[in-house]
């Protein structure tokens, strides 16, 4: 499906990839002041020796001297499950049982920034993306990845740590935004909404789609997480969104199927391993990227965020059990882990393809006001 | 395609079974709803069941009274409806339903009249 | 739970814009779908989740939900667009469809 505002719900169906340019082209409504913009936080932890909460529970790598590479998952923060989107959720939540910022949730008390002062920064994500004012950057190469088709074994855990659904990854994926842009896959999550309402974090000239997966990347410039965090480039993460197609998701189905065995909050298993770049769209050359942070406490800057423009496409059977299957903290499903966007503050979002460009007939003369800021060279 | 039966002229405080055979799509795959319109009027939720027919909604109008459920070997999708009351006279259509909450495939529906 | 709104009949000359719209309390946190439908006829869904066309409906349908309107844009209005509109979306209850109460166009 294309991304912007997209006239046509004619999914691509089979694969794991959606149509072609969802991200493009096509005039989509804006919805800045809408309720589905209050901030709904992000949700995402980052670990390290310092209980460092961020995209998910990031794994601390440790020097390859140390363990040849192997990344290992502490799970710091979880952020627990999400409020009434219509209140104003970028907060965190203190648990009793945990310290600083090891718990978190969407919805309540206290505001994030005064736990994680970053979450206040102004350079945060998720945001909006308008395709017609992003950056055509011809520098912006086909992402590279390299490794991502894993063998069953060893397994790979799968948990649900209450404010998502979370695959560690092993040691050895590869991932090359450009010449010398390396990163090490460490982990993958997802964020949905419920069924009759979106949940990316991302959106697309104020469109929001069913759910978003993300694959976080460690630059090979670092060893730990914890030193790569507000750094720029330090991290990197890919994002996809997903939406709802004819046919069942394969590659999807493996890691869904087991949902039921992690339905409450904590829980993990083990699943054999799968080909990752399977789960993200198969056109690497076209995606919009930008500078932003982790989607939860700390909030941390300087991420690379990479948002394809093309979608996958899961059943309605698929997203109803991503979206109704698993549990957070106390009684409450685990749905709508989505944080709101946040202003760009002045950022330009570049992007691989002239994306300005609507194919629509019903378009006026392209608009392409920002100009490139040739990353990558 | 989805096609209803079992509509007909039934007498207050009666019952009466709707069947909804499903085909060209994988039946099991889908949650179905059930949406009636009065004559003249608009169209309103009456109930809906998730694929395996675990899961069942009801509007309040009907609870109590109603009974969704399905069948997947059959590709079929039922409403039992007792205690039938004038008001529930209506056209029942029974609609594929999507993720996002809307129905891209709805039966001609069939007509229930509930007199003395 | 949520309720819908829409006018009870819009007037367009042929040719000219229709614009139907359907408000309700935080409509943007829900997908909000518009349904066709002509006497004697079952419902047709012709904008899905705020703004696609399925395939099969023609281009000058369109959608868009922002604040607490969603709105559904005939351009070109043709005498075959002449039917009754439905906005639909789900309600705070989960599982639990809402239909607004119909606008003739």
């Known amino acids: 499906q294309r991304l912007p505002r997209m006239q046509e719900d004619s999914p691509l169906g089979g694969g794991s990839s959606g149509e072609d340019d969802p991200l493009g082209e096509e005039d989509l409504p804006s919805e800045e002041d809408s309720p589905r913009e209050e901030d709904p936080p992000g949700e995402e932890d980052l670990p390290g020796e310092e209980d460092l909460p961020g995209e998910e529970d990031l794994p601390e790598v440790k020097p390859k001297s140390e363990e040849e590479g192997s990344l290992k998952l502490e799970d710091l923060p979880t952020v627990e499950a999400p409020g009434d989107p219509q209140e104003p959720q970028n907060n965190a939540h203190r648990d009793k049982e945990g310290d600083d910022q090891s718990h978190w949730r969407y919805g309540g008390d206290p505001p994030w920034p005064r736990v994680s002062p970053a979450c206040a920064g102004r350079f945060q994500s998720p945001v909006d993306i308008r395709p017609q004012l992003a950056a055509f950057c011809p520098a912006l190469r086909p992402l590279e990845l390299l490794g991502f088709q894993l063998p069953p074994l060893p397994e790979l855990r799968l948990r649900n740590n209450g404010h998502s659904v979370q695959l560690t990854l092993p040691p050895g994926l590869e991932m090359a935004l450009g010449p010398g842009r390396e990163y090490r896959a460490l982990q993958l999550h997802l964020h949905w909404g419920a069924a009759g309402r979106p949940g990316s974090e991302h959106t697309v000239e104020g469109h929001r789609f069913p759910a978003e997966i993300h694959v976080v990347h460690l630059s090979t410039a670092f060893a730990r997480v914890d030193e790569a965090l507000g750094r720029p480039g330090g991290l990197a993460v890919l994002a996809a969104f997903l939406e709802e197609g004819p046919e069942e998701n394969s590659a999807y189905e493996q890691l869904l199927s087991r949902l039921e065995e992690i339905a409450e909050e904590g829980s993990e298993t083990q699943v054999p391993g799968l080909d990752i770049s399977a789960l993200l769209p198969s056109d690497f050359s076209r995606y919009f990227q930008y500078e932003g942070s982790l989607t939860t406490p700390p909030c941390a800057q300087g991420v690379i965020w990479t948002v394809f423009n093309q979608t996958v496409m899961l059943s309605a059977k698929q997203l109803h059990t991503l979206s109704d299957t698993l549990w957070g903290p106390g009684d409450s499903r685990l749905q709508l882990n989505f944080r709101a966007t946040q202003p760009l503050n002045g950022r330009v979002i570049e992007a691989s393809f002239p994306a300005g460009v609507d194919s629509s007939p019903r378009a006026a003369e392209p608009v392409q006001l920002n100009s490139c800021l040739a990353a990558g060279d | 395609e989805l096609v209803e039966s079992g509509g007909g002229l039934v007498q207050p405080g009666g019952s009466l079974r709707l069947s909804c055979a499903a085909s060209g799509f994988t039946f099991s795959d889908y949650s179905i709803n059930w949406v009636r319109q009065a004559p003249g009027k608009g169209l309103e939720y009456v109930s809906n069941?998730?694929?395996?027919?675990?899961?069942?909604y009801y509007a309040d109008s009907v609870k109590g009274r109603f009974t969704i459920s399905r069948d997947n070997s059959k590709n079929t999708l039922y409403l039992q409806m007792n205690s039938l009351r004038a008001e529930d006279t209506a056209v029942y259509y029974c609609?594929?339903?999507?993720?996002?909450?809307?129905?891209?495939?709805w039966g001609q529906g069939t007509l229930v009249t509930v007199s003395s | 739970d949520i309720e819908l709104t829409q006018p009870p009949s819009v007037s367009v000359a042929p040719g000219q814009t229709a614009r139907i719209s359907c408000s309700g309390d935080?409509?943007?946190?829900?997908?909000v779908h518009w349904y066709q439908q002509k006497p004697g006829q079952a419902p047709v869904l012709v904008i899905s989740?705020?703004?696609k066309r399925p395939s099969g409906i023609p281009e000058r349908f369109s959608g868009s939900n922002s604040g607490n309107t969603a709105t559904l844009t005939i351009s070109g209005t043709q005498a075959e667009d002449e039917a009754d509109y439905y906005c639909?979306?789900?309600?705070?209850?989960?599982?639990?469809?809402?239909f607004g109460g119909g606008t003739k166009l």
């Open positions: 069941i998730s694929y395996s027919g675990s899961s069942t």
């Open positions: 639909s979306t789900y309600g705070y209850t989960y599982s639990y469809s809402v």
């Open positions: 989740e705020d703004n």
């Open positions: 609609a594929r339903f999507k993720y996002s909450g809307g129905s891209d495939s």
């Open positions: 935080n409509l943007p946190d829900f997908y």
